[in-house]
């Protein structure tokens, strides 16, 4: 298999790539001769061979054409050659040699006549493996590769020469090259082709950031004399909207974003947001969804919450406790707070005005985090409407109408006292019938009763409220053989009284009914 030439080698001469005759100078003419041959991969090539092994004192020279130096300071000569073992050649003991010599001569122009004495010897080249005639049958030629360094070279170019002193040798290929540190990208910084110095010192090279990136630390690398990059220092990082992919900063695809410069990857747009273009630094919210000014781009877009539910007022003379349930839809945020708008109304509810500043709200009127507030210092026998706004971090960005629940009350001197006793009249698997007596102090006309109940094992995490006009009620759709907790309070025009204590009753385990049973607490 052909082994590719290393990327850090720049050829100045490669005899294998020259089409047609090489046309090098052979002196004397009957010494080195140019012939067609094949390389180790059976590719046709032009080679030079000499095999003048009969005569003593051979001195056959072969000189290449002029080779431009380009930017090289140190050059490398790679010789691939085949050397025949002298023992495989009959009749020639004593005259046959198994080495040849490599020379070079620097020159600023390429019309120089060949003169032996102007050449400087690089080395004597010997084969690691010579071959006997017997190796030739299936073309198992022992191909030797020898590399020699020359330098520093200063003139515009040079010649190479090969001196044969009586060997049987074929030059299969001659390659002259210099080493460079090749263009590379390291830590998202580009380093250009760099020719090293001939000396042992390293060349410091400053890198430039690839497109769509910026310096984190100034990128630098060192180019060694062997054409190798060493000691990367510093780096570049991809800009916002771009992520590292291989050796480049690639734009985030639609549907992805990257908010800041750095090594992070592009992230998928958070819920209820999207991007339509490449290279997004953040994602745009869908219609009717918003992101608060201080929200990070990684946060999902949200909408205002729905209105609070199940508002309950508990009037005590000129005070009222308002309770409500959390909105069904939080809008996708946790920062929900509640604001109380207080309106004092005439006997016509449409004629209202803001409450007096003397009205007090506990713990406060705005920014409530719990679902209860106590309003005090109201006027007696006065109609009030309370609007409970649910807001979150994006409510102020939204144009739709406010999300609130309203409750209207009339203050009085007092609310009814608690219901004292609850009696179970009848039970079945799915229902319980209850009755009770009116509070001892109704403090007005009782309008209705609020019955609150829940399964005992659920510890009031989920409860149900229903209204009863009289002093008895049948509660259905219950679970069989289950203990329920009940509380009842009365409501007059002044509001709700306080809850009764908790009463526990059980549904039947099977289909028969049980009557008349007081509760156990």
């Amino acid at each position: 298999e052909l082994s590719p030439q290393p990327s850090n080698e720049v050829n100045l001469l490669d005899s294998k790539t020259i089409q047609g005759e090489l046309g090098w100078i052979s002196y004397p003419s009957h010494g080195w001769e140019e012939i067609s041959g094949v390389d180790e991969h059976y590719t046709p090539i032009r080679t030079y061979q000499v095999c003048n092994v009969m005569d003593h004192s051979q001195n056959n020279w072969l000189r290449t054409n002029w080779v431009p130096r380009n930017s090289a300071q140190k050059i490398y000569v790679e010789l691939k050659f085949t050397l025949r073992d002298c023992n495989s050649i009959p009749l020639v003991l004593g005259t046959c040699k198994e080495t040849f010599n490599l020379y070079y001569m620097e020159s600023d122009d390429h019309g120089v006549k060949f003169r032996e004495h102007q050449f400087t010897k690089i080395d004597t080249i010997a084969a690691d493996e010579s071959f006997t005639q017997m190796d030739l049958g299936d073309r198992i030629l022992k191909l030797n590769t020898e590399i020699r360094e020359v330098g520093p070279v200063n003139k515009k170019g040079f010649y190479l020469a090969f001196q044969d002193v009586g060997a049987c040798v074929a030059l299969v290929s001659v390659r002259v090259y210099f080493k460079k540190c090749p263009f590379t990208v390291k830590n998202l910084a580009m380093f250009p082709d760099t020719v090293p110095m001939d000396s042992q010192s390293l060349v410091e090279v400053r890198g430039s950031c690839v497109n769509n990136s910026k310096e984190e630390d100034p990128p630098r690398m060192y180019c060694s004399t062997e054409g190798e990059w060493l000691v990367p220092i510093g780096k570049c990082t991809c800009n916002a909207g771009y992520e590292e992919r291989g050796f480049i900063c690639q734009a985030c695809r639609p549907g992805f974003y990257k908010a800041s410069d750095g090594a992070a990857k592009c992230a998928k747009c958070p819920p209820h947001s999207s991007t339509q273009e490449d290279g997004s630094m953040n994602c745009r919210c869908e219609n009717n969804y918003f992101r608060a000014e201080k929200d990070p781009p990684s946060m999902a877009c949200a909408r205002p919450p729905s209105a609070p539910r199940n508002v309950i007022s508990n009037i005590n003379e000129t005070s009222v406790i308002l309770d409500w349930s959390w909105p069904l839809d939080t809008g996708g945020r946790k920062d929900i707070t509640f604001n109380i708008i207080c309106k004092k109304c005439g006997w016509n509810v449409r004629q209202c005005e803001p409450c007096s500043p003397n009205v007090r709200f506990l713990p406060r009127q705005l920014g409530l985090t719990n679902t209860t507030v106590t309003v005090t210092d109201l006027l007696a026998h006065t109609n009030y409407t309370f609007e409970i706004d649910a807001v979150n971090g994006v409510s102020e960005l939204s144009s739709p109408p406010r999300q609130y629940a309203a409750v209207s009350i009339t203050t009085n001197q007092a609310a009814p006292s608690p219901v004292m006793t609850i009696k179970k009249d009848r039970t079945s698997r799915n229902s319980i019938s209850l009755s009770w007596q009116e509070p001892e102090h109704p403090n007005g006309i009782i309008l209705d009763y609020e019955v609150k109940y829940y399964q005992k094992q659920e510890q009031e995490t989920s409860y149900t409220i229903l209204r009863a006009r009289g002093t008895n009620v049948t509660i259905s759709s219950l679970k069989p053989d289950t203990t329920y907790v009940f509380q009842i309070r009365a409501r007059t025009a002044a509001g709700y009284g306080t809850n009764s204590r908790k009463f526990e009753f059980e549904t039947s385990p099977d289909s028969f009914s049980i009557s008349g049973e007081n509760s156990h607490v």
Epitope: V53, H56, P90, L91, Q133, M134, L136, G137, R139, A170
Partner: antibody, heavy 121, light 106 residues
Framework: QVQLLQSGAEVKKPGASVKVPCKAS????????MSWVRQAPGQGLEWMGW????????TYAQGSTGRFVFSLDTSVSTAYLQISSLKAEDTAVYYC??????????????WGQGTLVTVSS | EIVLTQSPATLSVSPGERATLSCRAS??????PAWYQQKPGQAPRLLIY???TRATGIPDRFSASGSGTDFTLTISRVEPEDFAVYYC????????FGQGTKVEIK
């Protein structure tokens, strides 16, 4: 140009001797070995051996008798084949051929025109 | 000594056709033979040596291949001047020739 020039035909009686010259020109005589090949009438080629033109050292083919001798006169760039005690079966064309050693293999790249030696009583 | 046997003894071909000549060694040799051409009344001429190297001036329609004991000389398209006798020759310490193959006009 490179050439090997041989003498004309010889007719000899059995038991006689003959010396066939081969004069080289156009190259350095001592730089290439010289080989001798014979070809009986209507027959194929038979390699007889060779001589190192530098040292004068000969090598004879297996089966060759001592009747064949290779020699040189390097001053006139000439190789000789001497056959003594000629027999009728020695009748053949005798070729000298320059030996070419190369890295990739050997062969005889330049041939003389041949000398016909006829042995007849 | 190694004996080289050439076949066929005579090969009849028309100009422009391909000719394939065989040379078989009596024992395995790693050195591919040299090949020679001889026309009537002329000295032999070296065609190929060293497995596949053509001698100076030999056209590229001549090629050689093989290894071990079986070797082949191929003339890709026979020209009129190619009708002759062809010999293979094994080299080494001792050289031997095959008996020859005559290529004649069909």
């Amino acid at each position: 140009q490179v050439q090997l020039l041989q003498s004309g035909a010889e007719v000899k009686k059995p038991g006689a001797s003959v010396k066939v010259p081969c004069k080289a020109s156009g190259y350095t005589f001592t730089s290439r070995a010289m080989s001798w090949v014979r070809q009986a009438p209507g027959q194929g080629l038979e390699w007889m051996g060779w001589i190192n033109t530098n040292t004068g050292n000969p090598t004879y083919a297996q089966g060759s008798t001592g009747r064949f001798v290779f020699s040189l006169d390097t001053s006139v760039s000439t190789a000789y084949l001497q056959i003594s005690s000629l027999k009728a079966e020695d009748t053949a064309v005798y070729y000298c051929a320059r030996v070419r050693f190369t890295v990739y293999g050997d062969g005889m790249d330049v041939w003389g025109q041949g000398t016909l030696v006829t042995v007849s009583s | 000594e190694i004996v080289l046997t050439q076949s066929p003894a005579t090969l009849s071909v028309s100009p422009g056709e391909r000719a394939t000549l065989s040379c078989r060694a009596s024992q395995s040799v790693s050195s591919n033979p040299a090949w020679y051409q001889q026309k009537p009344g002329q000295a032999p001429r070296l065609l190929i040596y060293g497995a596949s190297t053509r001698a100076t001036g030999i056209p590229d329609r001549f090629s050689a291949s093989g290894s071990g004991t079986d070797f082949t000389l191929t003339i890709s398209r026979v020209e009129p001047e190619d009708f002759a006798v062809y010999y293979c020759q094994q080299y080494g310490p001792s050289w031997t020739f095959g008996q020859g193959t005559k290529v004649e006009i069909k």
